[in-house]
């Protein structure tokens, strides 16, 4: 009764198509699969960035797989062949592992790469990234930004740089069609006559870095003798009302009365007859139903009432 064995996949490699972190893992079927013609061979693929404690694991019948990686670090991957138990009259048979690695050989000491990279997707419409030059680099150093997301044929270079002292320190992006809810890859590289400059890679999703405009049209409405309803409107732009959370800051007679977070464009406030002045401001943020993260907007203009008994009339600006 001979032991059933299977070879690992052949020609296992990681291919970089130039998408700044979106890589192809590909392989060929193992040698000597003739005995298992009736079988559907599967492959177990494990991969990770160097230094990560956990492997991502995929089981597939295909000869390729694609995923995003952090190109600031190396990548390691391993794959083996799986023969399901149906093919072997018993337990599943696994081949030995085939292994491969990939990394972009760096140029330059890490301190030369851009510092404090910050990207904001203003009002879900305009992407702007800014950075500071690397430590110890001279003014002749210039940085260039490239970006890619699924849907673009190839990586594109920034065409509208923000400059300071002749150096590129940021990028205003053009309209980015169908670019949210998918990984957005950026590389900032550099050049200098003086020394080699380290490239930096960044990956994020645009909906997670949205900074909305502040809410508008703040109003007061008397609901009852001891309640006032604060209302506002969503800012102009493409973000639907269902995507907003709000933070309100209410001041009564120069003392902070309430800070609250709400999901709707209203807030009901309990008041006393002694209140002489009431002011509030609101800011907005994309909520967990539309993104995993976000940036608070600036505060709205302040809306106040003062000088008349709050209990006597409806208050509108």
């Amino acid at each position: 009764d001979t032991e059933i064995k299977v070879n690992p996949p052949q020609d296992f490699e990681i291919v970089d198509p130039g998408y700044l972190g979106y890589l192809y893992l590909q392989w060929q079927p193992p040698l000597s699969l003739d005995h298992f013609k009736e079988c559907t061979v599967e492959y177990e693929l494990k991969y990770r960035n160097i230094g990560s404690e956990t492997w991502k694991t995929i089981i597939t019948k295909n000869l390729h797989y694609k995923d995003g990686f952090d190109l600031n670090k190396g990548i390691e991957a391993k794959i083996h062949t799986l023969l399901p138990w149906q093919c072997t009259n018993g337990s599943e048979v696994q081949s030995s592992w085939a292994e491969t690695t990939y990394w972009i050989s760096p140029q330059g000491i890490p301190e030369t790469k851009v510092q404090d990279m910050d990207c904001v997707y203003y009002n879900w419409q305009y992407l702007l990234c800014s950075w500071k030059p690397g430590i110890g680099v001279l003014l002749d150093t210039n940085y260039n930004l490239f970006y890619w997301y699924e849907g673009l044929d190839h990586a594109l270079q920034c065409v509208d740089y923000i400059k300071a002292d002749g150096q590129n320190i940021g990028c205003r992006f053009p309209y980015l069609e169908a670019s949210d809810y998918k990984d957005f890859y950026i590389c900032v590289n550099g050049s200098s006559e003086n020394k080699p400059i380290r490239s930096s890679y960044f990956t994020f999703q645009l909906q997670n870095i949205v900074k909305p405009l502040p809410p508008v049209y703040l109003t007061f409405t008397r609901e009852s003798s001891c309640e006032i309803k604060l209302k506002w409107s969503i800012p102009l732009g493409p973000i639907p009302a269902r995507c907003f959370d709000y933070e309100i800051e209410i001041r009564e007679d120069d003392t902070t009365l309430v800070t609250a977070t709400v999901e709707n464009e209203t807030y009901t406030l309990k008041t006393t007859n002694e209140t002489r002045q009431l002011c509030f401001v609101v800011r907005s943020k994309v909520n967990i139903y539309c993104s995993d993260d976000g940036i608070w907007s600036e505060w709205s203009d302040k809306q106040c009432w003062e000088g008349e008994d709050l209990s006597k009339k409806t208050l509108l600006r």
Partner: antibody
Framework: QVQLQESGPGLVRPSQSLSLTCTVS????????VHWVRQSPGRGLEWLGV???????DYNAAFISRVTMSKDNSKNQVFFRMNSLQANDTAVYYC??????????WGQGTTVTVSS | EIVLTQSPSILSASVGEDVTITCTAS???????LHWYQQKPGSAPKLWIY???NLASGVPSRFSGSGSGTSFTLTISSLQAEDAATYYC?????????FGAGTKLEIK
């Protein structure tokens, strides 16, 4: 397997120049940078500089006026030159491969004595 | 230049003991760029722990590394005779790249 081997003169006269060669095997110089590090009892491990896979260099500022690095990718060799040696340059000189921003393989080192 | 100060400079411990070596940086170092090397007499240094906490290939699991900012440690749980060596921390963050002065670990 990956190997690096330093070679050069064991003895250098004061004020003379030192030339070392690092011959590598098991990897390509077009894919990896190579650093030079020296070690002496008085000064410990000192980084001298690096030649990157693309051929550009970074030097320790303390040695920038005295050190030059170059390479021949086709011969798998990296060259190190240091001028104006003095007695305190006596050390073991190592070449080391750069991988993942660390020195993952080192040569066995070559001892250089500066003496008249 | 980032100065790395290791302590103690000499450490004597018995087989089976747990030992800790510390490395303090004069300014902050990214954990990705702090490494440890082991060197035995007559040999070149060997990469031992990379990026603060990742063991290099072939390093026994009794070794571990941790830390952030300016304070980093290498720990050996249950010291073995073959661990006798000098251990160096190294920062790859800023030029010039620098090493600690080393901790010589002796077996009692």
């Amino acid at each position: 397997q990956v190997q690096l081997q330093e070679s050069g003169p064991g003895l250098v006269r004061p004020s003379q120049s030192l030339s070392l060669t690092c011959t590598v095997s098991g990897f390509s110089l077009t894919s990896y940078g190579v650093h030079w590090v020296r070690q002496s009892p008085g000064r410990g491990l000192e980084w001298l500089g690096v030649i990157w896979s693309g051929g550009s260099t970074d030097y320790n500022a303390a040695f920038i006026s005295r050190v030059t690095m170059s390479k021949d990718n086709s011969k798998n060799q990296v060259f190190f030159r240091m001028n104006s040696l003095q007695a305190n340059d006596t050390a073991v000189y190592y070449c080391a491969r750069d991988r993942y921003d660390a020195f993952d393989y080192w040569g066995q080192g070559t001892t250089v004595t500066v003496s008249s | 230049e980032i100065v790395l100060t290791q302590s103690p400079s000499i450490l004597s411990a018995s087989v089976g003991e747990d030992v800790t070596i510390t490395c303090t940086a004069s300014s902050s170092v990214s954990s990705s760029y702090l490494h440890w090397y082991q060197q035995k007499p007559g040999s070149a240094p060997k990469l031992w722990i990379y990026s603060t906490s990742n063991l290099a290939s072939g390093v026994p699991s009794r070794f571990s590394g941790s830390g952030s900012g300016t304070s980093f440690t290498l720990t050996i749980s249950s010291l073995q005779a073959e661990d006798a060596a000098t251990y160096y921390c190294h920062q790859y963050h800023r030029s010039p790249l620098t090493f600690g002065a080393g901790t010589k670990l002796e077996i009692k």
